[in-house]
């Protein structure tokens, strides 16, 4: 018996040769022997049952003088899924067709982080058949009649081919991804105290509405509990606040991608925050991380400290330097100073091996005295 | 060609109200955000108000907050400003604008109305 | 609300100068900036927007640019008709706000 594999919507194409490889009678029947369609010598494509009930059905005339009569069965729908009789050259030729049908959940829109399960079904007791796809960068998910995907990114997105193969047989199926989400799922910024800061939040897709609801939490290192710093709506791309807080005194863009300044960068305001975005018409929430990292160069009486405040990884480096010498003092920590700084342009510089995350000047005039 | 044209200016006593409309003509007017932007008498342009396409999103400048009203009829193609509790200060020439398909400018302008605040 | 801080308020110029004209923002406004020119009497009339895009029919001795929150109009040569207000205005967020002006004179 032969097996052919089709999706429902599609098209099949089950196979029939004569060994005399040219054209020849022959009669598509069900397994309950109703005629389907066949040639009975004339050349002439006949139809069994009435039009409406066989419209579906067809065979491919071109390929009769070969010796080839496929049947050909359009938009499939579930219930083909049976066996086809083949009869020709008095022989009868069997024909499995398995028709399944492929279900998104929760769709083929999604939301960076979310899951997507691909299920196949079929009226057919089938044995599990493998189904594999491929994305074009590479990426392969494979299941039987269930393939999950989990944890999507943005990279997801764009067109998978899917082919589902059952007893060597092969079908392939296309899936376009598209995954919502940020462009990063974190970014840190880095300011000297005082400077004015800047956070911007692109996303990773383009739609024409774009409609929904955010916020931003914010957890300050120096506070015990986090605290709503914005909400806003988003209605067919434009952004309008809601509720904002009064320390920072915070704006926000009207327009994408999402943008917010803070006045000024303060050792209070270092910490970290997460932006979520609920979508119209999506469940679940996009999340952007944002880190602020602030330094501080001050001299007091005989000391000339540096300080940073925010999350800074344990790896970087916070160094102490008079302009154009070799560091004075250099440690993994949030906080470095110098005991009778000599005269001249200190540095104090954040840095991850050779790599300068920021710096801040201060001008030792005489021991004891400085200027910014 | 997209024109503006402002009306419903006139002489109003302190304390009273006005109503300004902008008629829009050669543009589907829910597609744009629309402001109105004020020039008192030899100073510098003031935005005074704005309302987004859909007309679900209104704005306005903290000197005329809770005193003007801005509202669109997207079926008449047109503006307004309802101007209550006028003031001396509020005595300017009032344009209407249209802004850019994505906020970036106001790229077209009325010739503007006259308001006069006085008793 | 954001403050926008223009400078000079007034400028005597001669045709040929190159002329600019600096606007400075209270908050961090990206590139959501603009320039308009007035004339007496007239609608103000757009210039550049979006920091630097220059509009159409806009004569290409105007050009805009910016450093962190400082925006800049310039002028590279003055003509006749350039004698006029100009005015910039932040359109980054809600409530918009215009700079004070500056008068552009001949000299």
């Known amino acids: 018996k032969t097996l052919v594999l089709g999706k429902e919507g599609e098209s099949a194409e089950l196979p029939c040769e004569s060994s005399q490889k040219k054209i020849t009678v022959f009669t598509w029947k069900f397994s309950d022997q109703r005629k389907i369609l066949g040639q009975h010598g004339k050349g002439v494509l006949i139809r069994g049952g009435s039009p409406s009930q066989f419209d579906r059905f067809d065979s491919k005339k071109g390929a009769w003088e070969k010796g080839s009569f496929p049947l050909i069965i359009n938009k499939l729908k579930m219930e083909d899924s049976q066996t086809y009789i083949c009869e020709l050259e008095n022989r009868k030729e069997e024909v499995e067709l398995w028709v399944f049908k492929v279900t998104f959940s929760p769709g083929t829109s999604l939301l960076q982080g979310q899951s997507l399960t691909l299920t196949l079904d079929s009226n057919s007791k089938v044995s599990n058949p493998l189904t594999e796809c491929k994305h074009k960068k590479g990426k392969v998910v494979s299941g039987s009649k269930v393939l999950s995907m989990s944890n999507l990114r943005v990279q997801d997105s764009d067109f998978w081919n899917c082919t589902v193969t059952l007893d060597q047989k092969k079908n392939w199926f296309g899936m376009t991804l598209s995954v919502l989400g940020f462009q990063k799922a974190s970014s840190i910024v880095y300011k000297k105290e005082g400077e004015q800061v800047e956070f911007s939040f692109p996303l990773a897709f383009t739609v024409e509405k774009l409609t929904g609801s955010g916020e931003l939490w914010w957890q300050a290192e120096r506070a015990s509990s986090s605290k709503s710093w914005i909400t806003f709506d988003l209605k067919n791309k434009e952004v309008s606040v809601k509720r904002v807080t009064q320390d920072p005194k915070l704006q926000m863009g009207k327009k994408l991608p999402l943008h917010l300044t803070l006045p000024q960068a303060l050792p209070q305001y270092a910490g970290s925050g997460n932006l979520t975005l609920a979508l119209e018409a999506k469940t679940g929430k996009l999340h952007q991380e944002v880190n602020l990292v602030v330094m501080r160069a001050t001299q007091l009486q005989k000391n000339l400290t540096c300080e940073v405040w925010g999350p800074t990884s344990p790896k970087l480096m916070l160094s102490l330097k008079l302009e154009n010498k070799e560091a004075k003092v250099s440690k993994r920590e949030k906080a470095v100073w110098v005991l009778n700084p000599e005269a001249g342009m200190w540095q104090c510089l954040l840095s991850d091996g050779d790599k300068v995350k920021m710096d801040s000047r201060i001008q030792v005039l005489s021991r004891g005295v400085n200027q910014t | 060609e997209v024109e503006l044209l402002e009306s419903g200016g006139g002489l109003v006593q302190p304390g009273g109200s006005l109503r300004l409309s902008c008629a829009a003509s050669?543009?589907?007017?829910?597609?744009?955000?629309m402001s109105w932007v004020r020039q008192a008498p030899g100073k510098g342009l003031e935005w005074v108000s704005g309302?987004?396409?859909?007309?679900?999103?209104?704005y306005y400048a903290d000197s005329v907050k809770g005193r003007f009203t801005i509202t669109s009829d997207n079926s008449k193609n047109t503006l307004y400003l309802q101007m209550n509790s006028l003031r001396a200060e509020d005595t300017a020439v009032y344009y209407c604008a249209k802004e850019g398909y994505n906020w970036n400018y106001m790229d077209v302008w009325g010739k503007g109305t006259t308001v006069t605040v006085s008793s | 609300a954001i403050q926008m801080t223009q400078s000079p308020s007034s400028l005597s110029a001669s045709v040929g100068d190159r002329v600019t004209i600096t606007c400075r923002a209270s908050?961090?406004?990206?590139?959501?900036l603009g320039w308009y020119q007035q004339k007496p009497g007239k609608a103000p009339k757009v210039l550049i927007s979006?920091?630097?895009s220059l509009q159409s029919g806009v004569p290409s001795r105007f050009s805009g640019s910016r450093s962190g929150t400082d925006f800049t109009l310039t002028i590279s040569s003055l003509q006749p008709e350039d004698f006029a207000t100009y005015y910039c205005?932040?359109?980054?967020?809600?409530?918009?706000?215009f700079g004070q002006g500056t008068k552009l004179e001949i000299k």
């Open positions: 908050h961090g406004i990206r590139n959501d």
């Open positions: 979006e920091t630097s």
């Open positions: 205005l932040q359109d980054y967020t809600y409530p918009y706000t």
């Open positions: 050669g543009l589907t007017f829910s597609t744009f955000a």
């Open positions: 309302i987004s396409g859909s007309g679900e999103n209104t």
